[in-house]
């Protein structure tokens, strides 16, 4: 019996077409992604092969201007319009509190969304009761297929789930319910979920009983022959994995942001064994024309936006000094606005120990592109902000050791003076440049707010200690030379929309006034 | 639990023809096909057929002309039928999954006068 | 047809050996081949799928690999409950059995 799989994980807000790095579409001829034309793909499919599912494991919400406005309605609709089979719930899906989660999806969706470790305790458990689930059992062709759902235990540091849900270890929760479903006689098992590549293959090592893994938030790309575009494979797909009782389980990721549908056959056996399994991602380029009726309800649903871009968000009764001259060069105010945006955007006071699980920000000045002039009745609006972060990045949580830190500052002024993008601006960070010295040895003091304190004060960096940094996804991938990032972090989680992070904390403070105030010397 | 249990004659006379049923628990015949197996007495594993989850059948070439397999979708049954029997088709008969999964405990089938 | 070449066809040996049993296959058979264990009451049983998965409560002292035509079974330490017929089935194609290799007590 032959089971096709399609799924998504980590789309991020793409509901239109977008450029080929995921950014805005311009030259709509070279666009890829959108749910018009992830529709027309399915529906192909669909019509082609007797047994399919779709699922996406997660990171629907959060990423472009989509989100900002509509807070998740739009992923419910465009998901119900799709007829995606089961979601599992990622770490920004709780973005807006589970509020934000309760009412525009889960109570919208007309499809199961699931996870297994996630428990829900006190007043919440009653009101959240049965709008998520641990697992479903979905009817397919004669057979039927049990899917698990988990998502990472990490959130409560990622997102806003508050305190009434409680995130378990992932393989601890998975395995009762797998258990569950044999004992209700259902022998085909997909794990859905939301942890990232390496949970997902020890969920396919440790959990007895699963068959299948497709996963999500590591952005993995898994191929299989010539990769179709600029993505670099980290694996084979399906990427296999020997369990522990000697099956072997493919597991799946299809890189993110809807720019491919991921595509995987599994032949099962009379007792539910995985015979075989093939399949690949499918770029979904322009060859593959946008379904008209979706792109004709995307284009109705998209007017609300364009209205929002230019609606106040707060004011500004300073200069917002975004400018090459002065960001590339020398700390500047809009870097400092950046960067405390991103630290607010990151509080979580997840234990008493700790006043915030991340104090510090990096943020490469050559990502900053353009000032905001306050003689416009200091009014910020979002266009404003996307001419200073254009890129749709987002702003992301690493961990790294002092001695990569120190390395990155070491390569902020290596090569001083010239305009280049590299010269960080900071937050949560005091450092002091001797730009005599030569380029590798320049950085004579480093100090860093501690975070495991009550009263927030600043001490030198320790080379063996790890830190938690918030920083911009283009330097945790290594971008501006920043390579050591790239190949030191010891953990990487990707955030929110860069402009979102900004424009959500102008919003808050509602006048701001950012200075330059010496975390640069 | 997936189980198959074949039944039908242990003695049949030459010429006569062997009609034997496989009875499926545990998963469906319109998504797994029933592949059938014999083992003459000391001898090898031999395929005689199978029948696939749409109702096609495959056979054996060397038993092409005188194999049948058939089946009942709601009653989970499978019949083979194998006409003008000889002594040499004294063998041990199994059904088994499309895959291999499960089989038959086998039944004995003699062809003696 | 796919010819399938099994060997041996008998071995002896004792409690704890390490047991190995080849198949070869006429063509190209890409990984679509069990390990079917035959007591002497002729009771069939799965061992491993598709070359090299262990199928629910087998032991994991059993062993497969091999890819295109050739493939191996293995018994890491032979156990008492382990002497019977193994077969290598091919499903590639119409099925195909190898001859069977019967294992014995020393």
């Known amino acids: 019996w032959e089971l096709t799989i399609l799924h998504t994980n980590d789309v991020h807000s793409r509901l239109e077409q977008t450029s080929e790095d995921s950014s805005k579409c311009v030259n709509a001829s070279r666009c890829m992604g959108g749910v018009a034309r992830l529709f027309t793909k399915v529906q192909q499919i669909r019509r082609a092969e007797p047994n399919v599912l779709l699922l996406d494991a997660g990171d629907q919400y959060q990423g472009t201007i989509w989100f900002t406005v509509y807070k998740g309605a739009e992923v419910a609709h465009f998901m119900n319009a799709l007829r995606y089979d089961a979601m599992a719930l990622g770490n920004h899906e709780f973005d807006n509190g589970v509020e934000g989660l309760i009412e525009p999806l889960l109570k919208e969706a007309k499809f199961p969304i699931l996870s297994a470790n996630i428990k829900a305790k006190g007043p919440l458990a009653s009101q959240i009761s049965g709008l998520y689930l641990p697992y479903k059992v979905l009817p397919v062709g004669d057979e039927v297929v049990g899917i698990v759902g988990y998502t990472s235990k990490e959130t409560p540091f990622l997102s806003n789930p508050g305190t009434n849900l409680v995130f378990e270890d992932e393989i601890t929760a998975l395995q009762p319910e797998v258990d569950k479903l044999k004992t209700l006689n259902v022998n085909k098992i997909i794990a859905l979920g939301h942890s990232g590549f390496e949970m997902d293959k020890l969920i396919a090592q440790k959990v007895r009983g699963v068959d299948v893994v497709v996963g999500g938030h590591s952005n993995t790309f898994l191929y299989t022959g010539n990769p179709p575009s600029k993505e670099v494979p980290a694996g084979k797909y399906p990427f296999i994995v020997t369990s522990d009782d000697g099956r072997k389980v493919p597991v799946v990721q299809a890189y993110a942001f809807g720019k491919y549908l991921g595509y995987l056959k599994i032949e099962f056996d009379e007792r539910g064994n995985v015979i075989s399994s093939h399949g690949n991602p499918i770029l979904l380029n322009s060859s593959i024309p946008e379904d008209p009726s979706i792109k004709a309800d995307i284009n109705k649903w998209r007017i609300k936006l364009d209205n929002y871009s230019t609606q106040e968000l707060g004011k500004t009764i300073v200069y917002l000094d975004g400018s090459s001259q002065s960001c590339r060069f020398r700390e500047c105010n809009m870097g400092n606005l950046i960067c405390d945006a991103m630290i607010n955007n990151n509080l979580r006071h997840t234990d008493e120990m700790f006043w915030n699980h991340v104090s510090m920000c990096i943020l490469n000045g050559g990502g900053i592109r353009s000032p905001i002039d306050e003689r416009n009745n200091g009014t910020i609006t979002w266009e404003n902000l996307a001419a200073v972060l254009p890129f749709g990045g987002t702003f992301d949580l690493v961990q790294l050791k002092g001695s990569t830190l120190k390395k990155a500052f070491e390569h902020s002024v290596h090569r001083y003076g010239q305009s280049t993008g590299e010269f960080l601006q900071v937050g949560g960070i005091h450092v002091v440049y001797d730009l005599s010295r030569k380029p590798g040895d320049r950085v004579v003091k480093l100090d860093v707010l501690c975070t495991k304190c009550r009263v927030p004060s600043y001490d030198p960096l320790k080379m063996d200690e790890v830190y938690k940094v918030i920083l911009p996804n283009f330097l945790a991938n290594g971008g501006d030379g920043f390579q050591m990032i790239k190949d030191e972090l010891l953990r990487h989680d990707s955030g929110d929309q860069d402009i979102n992070v900004v424009s959500t904390y102008i919003s808050k403070m509602k006048v701001i006034y950012p200075a330059v105030e010496g975390r640069i010397k | 639990e997936v189980t198959l249990k074949e039944s039908g004659p242990v003695l049949v006379k030459p010429t006569e023809t062997l009609t034997l049923t496989c009875t499926v628990s545990?998963?469906?015949?319109?998504?797994?096909?029933i592949q059938w197996v014999r083992q003459p007495p000391g001898k090898l594993l031999e395929w005689l057929g199978v029948?696939?989850?749409?109702?096609?059948?495959d056979y054996n070439a060397a038993f092409i002309s005188r194999l049948t397999i058939s089946k009942d979708t709601s009653k989970s049954q499978v019949v083979l039928t194998m006409t003008n029997m000889d002594p040499v088709d004294t063998a041990t008969y199994y059904c088994?999954?499309?895959?291999?999964?499960?089989w038959g405990q086998g039944t004995l089938v003699t062809v003696s006068s | 047809d796919i010819q399938m070449t099994q060997s041996p066809s008998s071995l002896s040996a004792s409690v704890g050996d390490r047991v190995t049993i080849t198949c070869r296959a006429s063509?190209?058979?890409?990984?679509?081949l069990n390990w079917l264990q035959q007591k002497p009451g002729g009771a069939i049983k799965r061992l491993i799928y598709?070359?090299?998965s262990l199928d629910s409560g087998v032991p994991k002292r059993f062993s497969g690999s091999g890819s295109g035509t050739e493939y191996t079974l293995t018994i890491s330490s032979l156990q008492p409950e382990d002497f019977a017929t193994y077969y290598c089935?091919?499903?590639?194609?119409?099925?195909?059995f190898g001859g069977g290799t019967k294992v014995e007590i020393k």
């Open positions: 029948i696939w989850s749409g109702g096609s059948a």
């Open positions: 088994a999954g499309q895959y291999g999964s499960v």
């Open positions: 089935l091919q499903y590639a194609g119409s099925w195909t």
């Open positions: 545990g998963f469906s015949l319109s998504s797994y096909g």
């Open positions: 598709a070359t090299s």
């Open positions: 063509q190209d058979i890409g990984d679509r």
